[in-house]
């Protein structure tokens, strides 16, 4: 049986403020059943950057099409980067549990800092 | 070319077990989810059950009595069916789930299906 | 639990009509709903997902519509070979997976 690998490959990325940031998870199974959720930080205080199944996101978009089949790449975009983005981002998958999701694995996370200003 | 092959059904007796098998070939079997729905004669579609790796789900109307498992060396499905009634008189199929955007599953590919009839 | 109300139940239509089948959702599934053909003695076939995606090799005479709590099928001009029964199915809270009662199309 194939073991769930989450895949952030970056572990630093330098943004520039008002630019967008693209943060990169891709998985290695569809298992176990259940979705991926981003995050920014650890613990019960972490944010929720992006759930595709409900809530408003409006400056996170996805890198692959919602309509596509079988989708292993939840990587996401976040636009008009601010100072308040810098932090360490997780993606996340989650098991499916009734009624409550359950975490299942996380990516090993990538922090997002400013870089220097374009002169 | 997906394929799907239930095979097991046959007659059985209230209160009485039966094992079906779903033979799978032509995708990656081991990463999706896999799905058994039936159908009474001259009904509408009932979902049974789910598994995903070890994580697995039921209707109401089974839990307790049927189990789902895989076995993935064998791209082979199976539910086993115990202390059957005859409301559980269908056509099993086995059914391939399909995912669409980050998560929602539907079933993209079905097999034949094999008939379960619970008679005495 | 979601209950999926399919309207019609039955459909007597020509081949080259224009065909729509109703599927009403008793709370929002957003746009997490499949649509299947059932022939006769046959397994069901995927045609939509997403509400609105045609699965592969399906024609475009076949075409889905809809979100939160109405979707529609529709096909553009029956064909012969389109007789049979139509299912809904959500997917967006589950378990269970529910489906609709069904919508037979029947030749007048």
């Known amino acids: 049986e194939e073991e769930l690998q989450m895949i952030q490959p970056e572990k630093l990325l330098l943004v520039t403020v008002g630019k967008t940031a693209t943060l990169h998870c891709t998985v290695t199974s569809l298992l176990p059943v259940g979705p991926v959720l981003w995050f920014r930080g650890v613990g019960p205080g972490r944010e929720l950057i992006y759930n595709q199944k409900e809530g408003h996101f409006p400056r996170v978009t996805t890198v692959s099409d919602l309509t596509k089949r079988n989708n292993m790449d939840f990587s996401i975009r976040i636009s008009s980067i601010t100072p308040a983005d810098v932090g360490t981002y997780y993606c996340v998958k989650f098991r499916k549990g009734s009624p409550e999701n359950v975490e299942f694995k996380s990516g090993p996370g990538t922090e997002m800092a400013l870089g220097a200003k374009p002169s | 070319e997906v394929q799907l092959v239930e095979s097991g059904g046959g007659v059985v007796q209230p209160g009485g077990s039966l094992r079906l098998s779903c033979a799978a070939s032509?995708?990656?079997?081991?990463?999706?989810?896999m799905s058994w729905v039936r159908q009474a004669p001259g009904k509408g579609l009932e979902w049974v059950s789910t598994i995903g790796a070890d994580d697995t789900y039921y209707a109401d109307s089974v839990k307790g009595r049927f189990t789902i498992s895989r076995d993935n060396s064998k791209n082979t499905l199976y539910l086993q069916m115990n202390s059957l009634r005859a409301e559980d008189t269908a056509v099993y199929y086995c059914?391939?789930?399909?995912?669409?955007?980050?998560?929602?599953?539907?079933?993209?590919?079905w097999g034949q299906g094999t008939l379960v009839t619970v008679s005495s | 639990e979601i209950v999926l109300t399919q309207s019609p139940a039955t459909l007597s239509v020509s081949p080259g009509e224009r065909v729509t089948f109703s599927c009403r959702a008793s709370?929002?599934?957003?746009?997490?709903i499949a649509w299947y053909q059932q022939k006769p003695g046959q397994a069901p076939r995927l045609l939509i997902y997403?509400?609105?995606s045609r699965d592969t090799g399906i024609p475009d005479r076949f075409s889905g519509s809809g979100s939160g709590t109405d979707f529609t099928l529709t096909i553009s001009s029956l064909q012969s070979e389109d007789f049979g029964v139509y299912y809904c199915q959500q997917y967006y809270d589950w378990p269970p997976f529910t489906f609709g009662g069904g919508t037979k199309v029947e030749i007048k």
């Open positions: 709370q929002n599934v957003r746009s997490d």
């Open positions: 032509g995708f990656s079997f081991s990463i999706y989810a």
């Open positions: 059914a391939k789930d399909s995912t669409v955007g980050w998560s929602g599953d539907f079933f993209d590919y």
């Open positions: 997403a509400a609105s």
